[in-house]
């Protein structure tokens, strides 16, 4: 019996199309596939960022695969050909591995890259990123921000920089059409007359960095003798009510502090006959239905009511 062998894929490479971390892995069929014309050859692809513990494994019939990577680190990938058992009258046959690596040659020392990069998607409408210059860089250093997400045909540069002393320290983004629920890639690079500047790469999803506006129109009604209903309205903007979770801070007579999280725009509070005054503030965040994470809004303006006045209103009604 002659042992069945198959060659690894040819021309395996990692291609950078300039999308700031979204890379193409591509290859050609192995040599000498003539013996297996009736067979559907598959490929097992493994890839990871260098330094990562685990490989991502994909089995595909295609000759390419695309995914996002962290370009602050190198990338390694390997691939081999799989002949299913149907083709070999027995067990699956695997070729040896073909390997490929990719990294961007780092310029400058790590300290020159931007520090404390922070991006917030205000009210699911306006994206703003800010950073601090690298350690020990001179005032002649300037940073430039580029971004890309699936739907753009190329990476775009920021056109509205936030500047301090002529130095770019942030970016106000334009309206970003169809940009949520997908990876959003950013590169901040820099230039200086005196020394090379290290680039930095960031990836996140916009729905996970939303900071809503605070809730508005806080009201308070007495439902019964010892029950108070607190109500508020969702903030203006594109975020639907079902996407909010709220945190309420309630103060009774400047002593008791209750903090609770609720899903709806109402909260019923039990009070005692000793309660004289009631104050509350509310803040909002995008909930688990609409994001994996989020940023709490600022607190609403504080609203206070005298319980006696509420009771009078209730009795009148």
């Amino acid at each position: 019996d002659t042992e069945i062998k198959v060659n690894p894929p040819q021309d395996f490479e990692i291609v950078d199309p300039g999308y700031l971390g979204y890379l193409y892995l591509q290859w050609q069929p192995p040599l000498s596939l003539d013996n297996f014309k009736e067979c559907t050859v598959e490929y097992e692809l493994k890839y990871r960022n260098i330094g990562s513990e685990t490989w991502t494994t994909i089995i595909t019939k295609n000759l390419h695969y695309k995914d996002g990577f962290d370009l602050n680190k190198g990338i390694e990938a390997k691939i081999h050909t799989l002949l299913p058992w149907q083709c070999t009258n027995g067990s699956e046959v695997q070729s040896s591995w073909a390997e490929a690596t990719y990294w961007i040659s780092p310029q400058g020392i790590p300290e020159t890259k931007v520090q404390d990069m922070d991006c917030v998607y205000y009210n699911w409408q306006y994206l703003l990123c800010s950073w601090k210059p690298g350690i020990g860089v001179l005032l002649d250093t300037n940073y430039n921000l580029f971004y890309w997400y699936e739907g753009l045909d190329r990476a775009l540069q920021c056109v509205d920089y936030i500047k301090v002393d002529g130095q770019n320290i942030g970016c106000r983004f334009p309206y970003l059409e169809s940009s949520d629920y997908k990876d959003f890639y950013i590169c901040v690079n820099g230039s200086s007359e005196t020394k090379p500047i290290r680039s930095s790469y960031f990836t996140f999803q916009l729905q996970n960095i939303v900071k809503p506006l605070p809730p508005v129109c806080l009201t308070c009604t007495q439902e019964s003798l010892y029950e108070i209903k607190l109500k508020w309205s969702i903030p203006l903007g594109p975020i639907p009510a079902r996407c909010f979770v709220y945190e309420i801070e309630i103060r009774e007579d400047d002593t008791t502090l209750v903090t609770t999280t609720v899903e709806n725009e109402t909260y019923t509070l039990k009070i005692t006959n000793e309660t004289r005054q009631l104050c509350f503030v509310v803040r909002s965040k995008v909930n688990i239905y609409c994001s994996d994470d989020g940023i709490w809004s600022e607190w609403s303006d504080k609203q206070c009511w005298e319980v006696e006045e509420l009771l009078k209103k209730t009795l009148l009604l």
Epitope: D180, Y181, P240, R242, C243, I288, Y289, D292
Partner: nanobody
Framework: QVQLQESGGGLVQPGGSLRLSCAAS????????MGWYRQAPGKQRERVAG???????VYAASVEGRFTISRDNAKNTGYLQMNNLKPEDTAVYYC?????????WGQGTQVTVSS
């Protein structure tokens, strides 16, 4: 039209376990979160657990440590594993799949905890 179908409810003794499933007829799981709610007779509907599209979870204090929510996006199905059930867990359990564009509810499945 997307539909959600709960299953796995039934009668169980205190201390027992049940696993509820919520199957969606369309592929709406990818970017949407899902939650399990319950409503006992004469009480308001309350959320017992929720899971984001990326797998972050939240639980009501009354079920923390006993219930586990999970999801299988490939199968368009969500699950609620309920252990150490108590009589006060008796209710109709509903699943909800929602997001910025969508909001779908199932018809509910009855869970009764009684000896």
């Amino acid at each position: 039209q997307v539909q959600l179908q709960e299953s796995g409810g039934g009668l169980v003794q205190p201390g027992g376990s049940l696993r509820l499933s919520c199957a969606a007829s369309g592929s709406i799981f990818n970017t949407n979160g899902m939650g399990w709610y319950r409503q006992a007779p004469g009480k308001q509907r309350e959320r017992v657990a929720g899971i984001s599209s990326g797998g972050n979870t939240v639980y009501a204090a009354s079920v923390e440590g006993r219930f586990t929510i999970s999801r299988d996006n490939a199968k368009n199905t969500g699950y609620l594993q309920m252990n150490n059930l108590k009589p006060e867990d008796t209710a109709v359990y509903y699943c909800r799949v929602a997001g910025r564009q969508d909001d779908y509810w199932g018809q509910g499945t009855q869970v009764t905890v009684s000896s």
